[in-house]
Amino acid sequence: LPAQVAFTPYAPEPGSTCRLREYYDQTAQMCCSKCSPGQHAKVFCTKTSDTVCDSCEDSTYTQLWNWVPECLSCGSRCSSDQVETQACTREQNRICTCRPGWYCALSKQEGCRLCAPLRKCRPGFGVARPGTETSDVVCKPCAPGTFSNTTSSTDICRPHQICNVVAIPGNASMDAVCTSTSPTRSMAPGAVHLPQPVSTRSQHTQPTPEPSTAPSTSFLLPMGPSPPAEGSTGD
């Protein structure tokens, strides 16, 4: 019979491959059927009998056509900082990805092995580069004329409001405060109404960095001791 109509198992012509969804069994020296995804080889083929396939047991899988004797174990359940984006089935492994506000610090072939909380930029610092699924937020000091008054992993430095008359100059962590456009009659001429309390901080003084706390996760990232990232908190 020509190879196209032979039934498995069969001996391939010299120099010929096996066909679609078949493999060459070295022991039997025959082309034999592979097992479909979700199955594994329960009994290997012989010269006279084809592969016997069986379904994967619970919590195990095979994703590819195969002739493996045992299915692969699904990964462990997703941790509290993760969400399960793909369940463990007979044909696919469980996939865990980081929940919102976290990023993948250590990825694996599919999904994430280790999530870490996104850095929060504290007042006086804004987001220079947003966090992604696989990278942390990068903070930068707010440039003159801009400010951020929040502790946030998403807020950027915003421009100070422009005043006709400035009551309090803005700084890196506070917006400028403008005078009232129509002063009240009881006020002395030229008097400026200041909100209480009055900040005495000069306009562009940066807040002094606070000590960083370790990320609130149950693992240590593979890095030596280092100063806290500028303008970030460990919250």
Epitope: A3, Q4, P12, G15, S16, T17, R19, L20, R21, K34, L64, W65
Partner: antibody
Amino acid sequence: QVQLVQSGAEVKKPGASVKVSCKASGYTFITYDINWVRQAPGQGLEWIGWIYPRDGNTQYAQKFQGRVTMTTDTSTSTAYMELRSLRSDDTAVYYCARGDRDYGYFDVWGQGTTVTVSS
Amino acid sequence: DIQMTPSTSSLSASVGDRVTITCRASQDISNYLNWYQQKPGKAVKLLIYFKSKLHSGVPSRFSGSGSGTDFTLTISSLQPEDFATYYCQQGNTLPLTFGGGTKLELK
């Protein structure tokens, strides 16, 4: 990125042979079949066969058996397809394509080599 | 050999349209149906394999359905770059065979 780059156009006389090359890059050459597919002017696509570079074993469509030879040079990640006893109806664009033998698809294609057979 | 036949050799549509291209196999091919896109002077591109699995990098507006002998490629909202020729191909048995192609043209 994964790429297949084919040799240039060829003009051949009836009865002659042609050898087209296909250089692979961006992946492990020996782990995927290289298929050859042709397309005659204004026609559809026609599968010629595949070669498995790891061992050089082949699978040819019966229509081309005895007239086609597929080979590979693993040192240069290059596949070759030689077609002999050319006829005018062999005039076509010949493509190499990386294949998947489980689902029978071609996921990366070369740019094509035009072979013209004319007396 | 398994014959693959598109329902039409050409199709006219406008940008934004929902387009379906169908393909019939001469015998049951299970789900082993693949779809390709070909543009003049460009390399052929795999769109969908195993009836409905989207190849990596292919926009989600492309989808595939069907089973046995009748299969459909759907483009949910036609984009200017989608005007091309589309081929179906069976991966069930050797020899691997293609349909004649459906040319998608601007209306």
